[in-house]
């Protein structure tokens, strides 16, 4: 059965998924998809990484953590009730039927009538969105755009401002984690 995670309409949802790279920079392809994990890859892919970088993503979906260290947890921006459902995190470890797959259930609750004001920085304003693409075929050139002039440490620091550190630790403890190597 799927592990369940909750968020309110209008909030950002966080779905944890981690692995430990065998060596620094020795990354494993990962995909995130809406729907339970199928036999291969992910269905309805919302984000992919390869051995080097995020190579496909759609608007509202991103990796806040340091994916180069194996934190491939998915953030979904400004969720609506339609974002409810099962999500697949698939870690594509090379070998014979080595893939690790995790199904995570996201439950979206209606927003409270009078939400308390927050003092979080606007992540979108502080770190402008990368150019998103919607691919329709492998032959189509994917223009992924480039990162703003900001280093990974800054990104991690900025991302951490979006999450209460204790909550993030709780989610990390309860999230999907595997060790490679």
């Amino acid at each position: 059965s799927e592990v369940e995670y909750r968020a309110e309409v209008g909030q950002n949802a966080y779905l944890p998924c981690f692995y430990t790279p065998a060596a620094p920079g020795n990354l494993v392809p990962v995909c995130w998809g809406k729907g339970a994990c199928p036999v291969f890859e992910c269905g309805n892919v919302v984000l992919r990484t390869d051995e080097r970088d995020v190579n496909y993503w759609t608007s509202r979906y991103w990796l806040n953590g340091d994916f180069r260290k194996g934190d491939v947890s998915l953030t979904i921006e400004n969720v609506t009730l339609a974002d409810s459902g099962i999500y697949c995190c698939r870690i594509q470890i090379p070998g014979i039927m080595n893939d690790e797959k995790f199904n995570l259930k996201l439950v979206i609750k209606p927003a409270k009538v009078t939400p308390a004001p927050t003092r979080q920085r606007d992540f979108t304003a502080a770190f402008p969105r990368m150019l998103t693409t919607r691919g329709h075929g492998p032959a189509e050139t994917q223009t992924l755009g480039s990162l703003p002039d900001i280093n990974l440490t800054q990104i991690s620091t900025l991302a951490n401002e979006l999450r209460d550190s204790r909550l993030a630790n709780d989610l990390r403890d309860s999230g999907a984690t595997i060790r490679i190597g």
Epitope: G33, G35, A36, P38, V39, F40, E41, C42, G43, N44, V45, R48, Y56, T58, Q92, I93, P94, G95, I96, M97, N98, D99, T133, R134, G135, H136, G137, P138, A139, E140, Q142
Partner: antibody, heavy 123, light 107 residues
Amino acid sequence: EVQLVESGGGLVKPGGSLRLSCAASGFTFSDYYMTWVRQAPGKGLEWVASINYDGRNTYYLDSLKSRFTISRDNAKNILYLQMNSLRAEDTAVYYCARGYYYYGSSPNYFDYWGQGTLVTVSS
Amino acid sequence: DIQMTQSPSSLSASVGDRVTITCRASENIYSYLTWYQQKPGKSPKLLVYNAKTLAEGVPSRFSGSGSGTQFTLTISSLQPEDFATYYCQQHYGTPLTFGQGTKLEIK
């Protein structure tokens, strides 16, 4: 035009080996998962093995993975199936198939198939 | 393994008939179901994927429906070229498995 052409089938004695090939053309081979499916005479379809784009990930029918090996050569656009310790029950037409794929989907169904190559295992 | 059971195993019908073929999975496979058509001596042809999405070039008289464990392939008005064997295939669990096939014959 997408084309998949299998070769390498034939008559082999029980315990023997064969290597099937599937030559691909008309598409960017290295963008696609590839699969072998077999069909015994007068019977239904049975999945045999699949391989991801770069050959680093392979998937097998459990009962075959000790005897069969799927591989690919992206430079030559060829898919292979090495079959060892063949048995009479391996007699079938072997099809190679392309995993339907686009960036927002997954290659779990097969949009193009070869014409098949017949493998007969008999003494 | 997930077992896929098709019914009927064979079916006789006439040109113009509406025909429905059923595929049942032994466990929940969500919408991870594909339908293929195969004619004698030929390789299979993709008809429907993800339970209800028509593959490119497939006539609109074909339609797929269902989710979970029960799925159907419907041909709204049979044409002479539709007489063939139809297979369902699940792609939720390893190994990929096919139904045993439904042979559609001319009455």
